[in-house]
């Protein structure tokens, strides 16, 4: 007995299309090895029609195809277009056609039923809006307009000119006759249901001059789509529901055990809880579509979602729907990275963001999701530079580590930082994931001053201060601009072994700038990483004024009397403990020093650390 | 929700036929297949035969025991679905339940179907 099954008998008309889903024991000899859909020939032969290796016959040209679905052990073999001559007996199978691993499938091709001359046919989804159109001459324009289902040898009245209504379409019929000189009534029958399946009359007047149509309605029930989409990944619903329900809520359920519908969003403002900072409903379009995009795919996120619309933004029966079947691939080709993120007040953090390494150029972009209404996530940075205006100083993207990986870095936390952020691409939508900030108690790591005032022309020098257990980490001072942050130049950093016993006060890493020049007003960040892997950084702005009186060492009050939660340094400078600085205008009237003396020889900028360089691992 | 009620089961010598009729009432949004299943005293419930519809489309899965003597049939005006059973035989006696779903991933598995009837007895005497 072959384990390979299918359907035995598959029925269908002329014109029509099937779809044959085949069910194959899912070892991985089998996910991998050929697929195949062949016809039984005379001879016993089976000649194959379409293959999983991309092998399709004239015959199947451009109306067939053979998708493998290893994750759950089936293929499925499509055939448009059909015709009675593909009348015949099959087989779909593994391997070889000669061989055993097959199933045999009878496929009938009728012609349809016979329907009277000139019968309209309409074919319409489950819960749509159908039109039919009911020609008439003008002599019987005065006359009353009908239209009729037949139902066996009867006919019965659905609606007429003269307010019949068949209890049946209460509510969602209407008749319309034009104005004078159109030739042609309609009739609109809105949320279709399968009983409404059948032949229809159209009839204008009465007696042997009256007008007749024949319409045929076939209500078709909506096929899921099947949607495979790896862990971590992303998914998007595209629900079109028609120009009827355009003003009508919307809602994306999902259908649970007992066979009821959950909503996991809709356009009233719901959203299922699990959900939480990973799903959008994108706003609709003029003709009513809209689309759901679910992010940090989980397995259990697997299930069938149908898409609707009602007024009360859930599923009611006789609206209309589209239906998926959601199969989530734990063997995923993205890779995990931490969906929560910890910082602390004033702190830092680095997000590691995959992407699809085959689209190394694409832009790459970070959002925050809110969750006002549908969902919404506007752009904080993309890699071409541009960050928002309130995240100046404080945020930036960088490409490294590469290789299907980029950094996001936000510094001066707050707690209104906590939040969801998006990571994504202008390439594979599939890619999108999510990653949760929380702000935690505690320090932070790296300690700089809260803002530094220099004078034109001297030498400034900032001190960051770090832990031990940095010490092993590369130490790096950078300049930033909305286009990222450029490293300053290092300078000798002094012996290996200063950081052997940690020493307290070696446990620095200092900018010096000199000569000060306009160009240098603006945001500097230390930072420490490893390799291409980016740890804690921290902002301090640097404003640049005019000399006030040559030779003197200007003071500001602020400086000469210190409030009690400010840290005096040894570099004069001061550090203002867990302030995050948004916006270094604030900060306008606090005044510091910077050194004056010029530092022979070096760069112009320089970083300055007696700490040792060893590379380590990540500091993710 | 959606109501399955089973009818046309009894007692019937070998060799003989038997039509089950599945009616389906009070639906929520479409079923599109439904099939019957059935369970022997002291034997786990098993797979019998399903049709699946779409349009005027229509797939019809057998159990390999079935050998060509059962036919599943539907009458989509009258929500009803049939299973004719010919050349019964003493082993087929069991309780047939009818089942729908909305979404068929695989025919022959229970858990693929979300509603079921109380069923209906068969006994085949020989």
């Known amino acids: 007995k072959s384990p390979v099954f299918g359907p035995q008998e598959v029925s269908s008309v002329e014109g029509n299309s099937v779809s044959i889903k085949c069910y194959y024991p899912p070892t991985s000899v089998n996910r991998h090895t050929r697929k195949y859909w062949c016809r039984k020939g005379a001879s016993g032969r089976c000649i194959t029609l379409v293959s999983s290796e991309g092998y399709v016959s004239s015959n199947y040209a451009g109306r067939a195809n053979l998708t493998n679905f290893p994750e759950n052990g089936t293929f499925v073999v499509n055939i448009a277009q059909l015709s009675r001559d593909d009348s015949g007996h099959y087989k779909c199978g593994l391997g070889i056609n000669s061989r055993g691993l097959s199933f045999d499938v009878s496929l009938e091709v009728s012609q349809g039923p016979e329907l009277p001359n000139g019968t309209e046919v309409y074919t319409v989804d489950v819960g749509r809006t159908v039109t039919i159109k009911c020609p008439f001459k003008t002599e019987n324009a005065p006359k009353t307009k009908a239209l009729y289902k037949k139902i066996g040898q009867t006919s019965v009245l659905v609606i007429d000119s003269r307010n019949y209504v068949n209890p049946n379409y209460k509510d969602r019929i209407r008749l319309r006759i034009p104005g004078t000189g159109q030739l042609i009534f309609t009739v609109v029958i809105d949320r279709l249901r399968l009983s409404d399946h059948g032949l229809y009359l159209c009839q204008a007047g009465d007696g042997s001059n009256r007008d007749e149509k024949n319409a045929d309605l076939q209500v078709l029930e909506p096929e899921p789509e099947l949607v495979y989409e790896d862990l971590r990944g992303s998914v998007t619903f595209h629900c079109a529901l028609g120009l009827e329900v355009a003003n009508v809520a919307k809602f994306l359920c999902r259908v649970n055990s007992r066979e009821t519908c959950d909503v996991v969003i809709n356009t009233l403002g719901k959203r299922d809880s699990a959900f939480e900072g990973r799903i959008l409903l994108n706003p609709q379009d003029k003709d009513g579509s809209f689309s759901v995009v679910i992010t940090g795919l989980r397995k259990e996120d697997e299930g069938r979602y149908l898409c609707g619309a009602h007024s009360d933004g859930q599923l009611q029966e006789g609206w209309p729907i589209q239906a998926w079947q959601l199969f989530v691939n734990e063997e995923s080709t993205i890779p995990r990275s931490p969906t929560v993120v910890k910082g602390v007040a004033g702190g830092s953090v680095a997000v590691l963001c995959p992407y699809n390494p085959k689209e190394s150029q694409s832009l790459k972009y970070w959002c925050l999701w809110e969750g006002a209404q549908n969902g919404r996530c506007p752009l904080l940075v993309e890699s071409q530079g541009l960050v928002q205006e309130q995240y100046e100083g404080r945020l930036s993207l960088l490409q490294e580590p590469g290789n299907g990986t980029f950094t996001v870095i936000l510094n001066q936390l707050t707690t209104q930082d906590a939040g969801f952020y998006w990571c994504l691409t202008n390439g594979d939508t599939r890619w999108r994931t999510t990653v949760e900030i929380k702000i935690i108690e505690g320090e932070p790591n790296l300690k700089v001053p809260g803002n530094v005032t220099a004078v034109l022309g001297e030498t400034l020098n900032i001190p960051c201060h770090f832990p031990c257990k940095f010490s092993s980490y590369e130490k790096y001072w950078c300049k930033w601009s909305n286009t990222g942050c450029q490293t300053l130049p290092s300078q000798d950093e002094g012996p290996s072994e200063a950081f052997v016993n940690c020493d307290e006060n070696s446990r620095l890493v200092s900018l010096t700038l000199n000569p000060v020049t306009r160009a240098d007003e603006g945001w500097y960040w230390c930072g420490v990483k490893q390799g291409h892997f980016y740890g804690e950084t921290a902002a301090v702005y640097v404003a640049v004024e005019e000399k006030k009186v040559a030779g003197s060492r200007y003071v500001s009050p602020a400086k000469a009397d210190a409030a009690p939660d400010e840290k005096v340094l040894d570099s004069g400078v001061r550090e203002i403990e867990n302030k995050a600085i948004q916006d270094p205008r604030l900060f306008a009237e606090e005044k510091v020093v910077a050194d004056t003396g010029d530092q022979a020889g070096g760069s112009r900028a320089s970083v300055d650390s007696s700490s040792s360089e060893e590379q380590g691992g990540s500091s993710k | 929700e959606v109501q399955l009620v089973e009818s046309g089961g009894g007692l019937v010598q070998a060799g003989d036929s038997l039509r089950l009729s599945c009616a389906a009432s009070?639906?929520?949004?479409?079923?599109?297949?439904m099939g019957w299943f059935r369970q022997a005293p002291g034997k786990e419930r098993e797979f019998v035969a399903t049709?699946?519809?779409?349009?005027?489309?229509?797939?019809?899965y057998y159990a390999d025991f079935v050998k060509g003597r059962f036919t599943i049939s539907r009458d989509n005006a009258k929500n009803t679905v049939y299973l004719q059973m010919d050349s019964l035989k003493p082993e087929d006696t069991a309780v047939y339940y009818c089942?729908?779903?909305?979404?068929?991933?695989?025919?022959?598995?229970?858990?693929?179907?979300?509603?079921w009837g109380q069923g209906t007895q068969v006994t085949v005497s020989s």
């Open positions: 049709i699946r519809w779409s349009g005027s489309t229509q797939y019809k």
């Open positions: 089942a729908a779903t909305t979404l068929l991933t695989d025919p022959r598995a229970l858990n693929a179907y979300a509603y």
């Open positions: 009070g639906r929520t949004f479409p079923t599109y297949a």
